[in-house]
Amino acid sequence: ARNGDHCPLGPGRCCRLHTVRASLEDLGWADWVLSPREVQVTMCIGACPSQFRAANMHAQIKTSLHRLKPDTVPAPCCVPASYNPMVLIQKTDTGVSLQTYDDLLAKDCHCI
Amino acid sequence: ARNGDHCPLGPGRCCRLHTVRASLEDLGWADWVLSPREVQVTMCIGACPSQFRAANMHAQIKTSLHRLKPDTVPAPCCVPASYNPMVLIQKTDTGVSLQTYDDLLAKDCHCI
């Protein structure tokens, strides 16, 4: 159950999808990936205020307990709810291969 | 792919399962749950240093980019990898019912 999508902290401050451009060197992939030479990494960044995009019952509990015991229980965290697949052209022992990764690019975000 | 389980920050400091005792009042459930009157909430708490329990490729990317751009990209976050089901005895309009929740108690943790 996705809870409220209204961000009380102001536009763009809450958990949402961001794109970060990264080179193979940035990612530490230069020694095993040939292409793409640059990746538009989509990731989930932002705050998770009370019930904002709560992923499930556990997230709702976490929000309640964080309010009560902020030093013990952290606030929910903005993480991928789903992913977009991406193909990499990889170096192999014998040459090159295509490999599809299903867990590389965030598609959608929620708080948990 | 779960990466290293060794915590470089010291015993118990990294992402792991914790148990937090909470009453129905703490959880805001007193008006709709009859039992249990207290819940041993298992949740994922702790730091996610480089490659510690990295859930997937996305988590590994996040670690790399956090190292490069700590003000832009947050470190991976400690969240449930799976859940244990829990049954609640709920109040209903006509009386009481048993309801099983599959996403309430964390069973296992990883960093993402």
Epitope: S35, P36, N84, P85, M86, V87, I89, T100 | -
Partner: antibody
Framework: QVTLKESGPGIVQPSQPFRLTCTFS??????????ITWIRQPSGKGLEWLAT???????RYNPSLKSRLTVSKDTSNNQAFLNIITVETADTAIYYC??????????WGQGTLVTVSA | DIVMTQSQKFMSTSVGDRVSVTCKAS??????VAWYQQKSGQSPKALIY???YRNSGVPDRFTGSGSGTDFTLTISNVESEDLAEYFC?????????FGGGTKLEIK
């Protein structure tokens, strides 16, 4: 297993349009880095890149042919399309649809012959 | 557009020999070159990517080399099944372009 198959009209009259269909399997056109490229080869000649339609609809065309080409896709049915308007006899060729993985033409269809003739 | 020149349209070789197919780019393309093999009546098949990396399933007698403007596809210990036309292609800049092809004949 990746497979691609082209289908089209076979014979087209000069100045008429035609449409080729590429039906593929073994991969998804919604995967980042994946595209469908159209390449043609006149009889006994070399290869000419025509256009690529990418997963994110960032379509690319050969500048020398751009005004006559359009590409499109139906991701859910695993199909891609090439439209050429006002064909000329010089458009007679075998047309290949190819799986592009980033900048690599990884897998090729068997090709379909298009003959432009009155 | 970058022109890829395969100066030898035909090359003749014998089974067991070593043969080198060359390709020259009209400007620097780094290592952004691929090679394709096309047997008679068939569609091209990807052999080499990034100048020197063999596609999976390609026998190790096929070797790619070169960078900048000069590229070579070498077939060591030629087999009769290598009778085909070989195309180079640059993908360093848009539009991608192919060489005119080199037909390998087996004596």
């Amino acid at each position: 297993q990746v497979t691609l198959k082209e289908s089209g009209p076979g014979i087209v009259q000069p100045s008429q349009p035609f449409r080729l269909t590429c039906t593929f399997s073994g991969f998804s056109l919604s995967t980042s880095g994946i595209g469908i490229t159209w390449i043609r080869q006149p009889s006994g000649k070399g290869l000419e890149w025509l256009a690529t339609i990418w997963w994110d609809d960032d379509n690319r065309y050969n500048p020398s042919l751009k005004s006559r080409l359009t590409v499109s896709k139906d991701t859910s049915n695993n199909q891609a399309f090439l439209n050429i308007i006002t064909v000329e006899t010089a458009d007679t060729a075998i047309y290949y649809c190819v799986q592009s993985a980033w900048d690599w033409f990884a897998y090729w269809g068997q090709g379909t012959l298009v003959t432009v003739s009155a | 557009d970058i022109v890829m020149t395969q100066s030898q349209k035909f090359m003749s070789t014998s089974v067991g020999d070593r043969v080198s197919v060359t390709c020259k780019a009209s400007q620097n393309v780094g290592t952004n070159v691929a090679w394709y093999q096309q047997k008679s009546g068939q569609s091209p098949k990807a052999l080499i990517y990034s100048a020197s990396y063999r596609n999976s399933g390609v026998p190790d007698r096929f070797t790619g080399s070169g960078s900048g403007t000069d590229f070579t596809l070498t077939i060591s210990n030629v087999e009769s099944e290598d009778l085909a036309e070989y195309f180079c292609q640059q993908y360093n800049s848009h539009p991608v372009t192919f060489g005119g092809g080199t037909k390998l004949e087996i004596k």
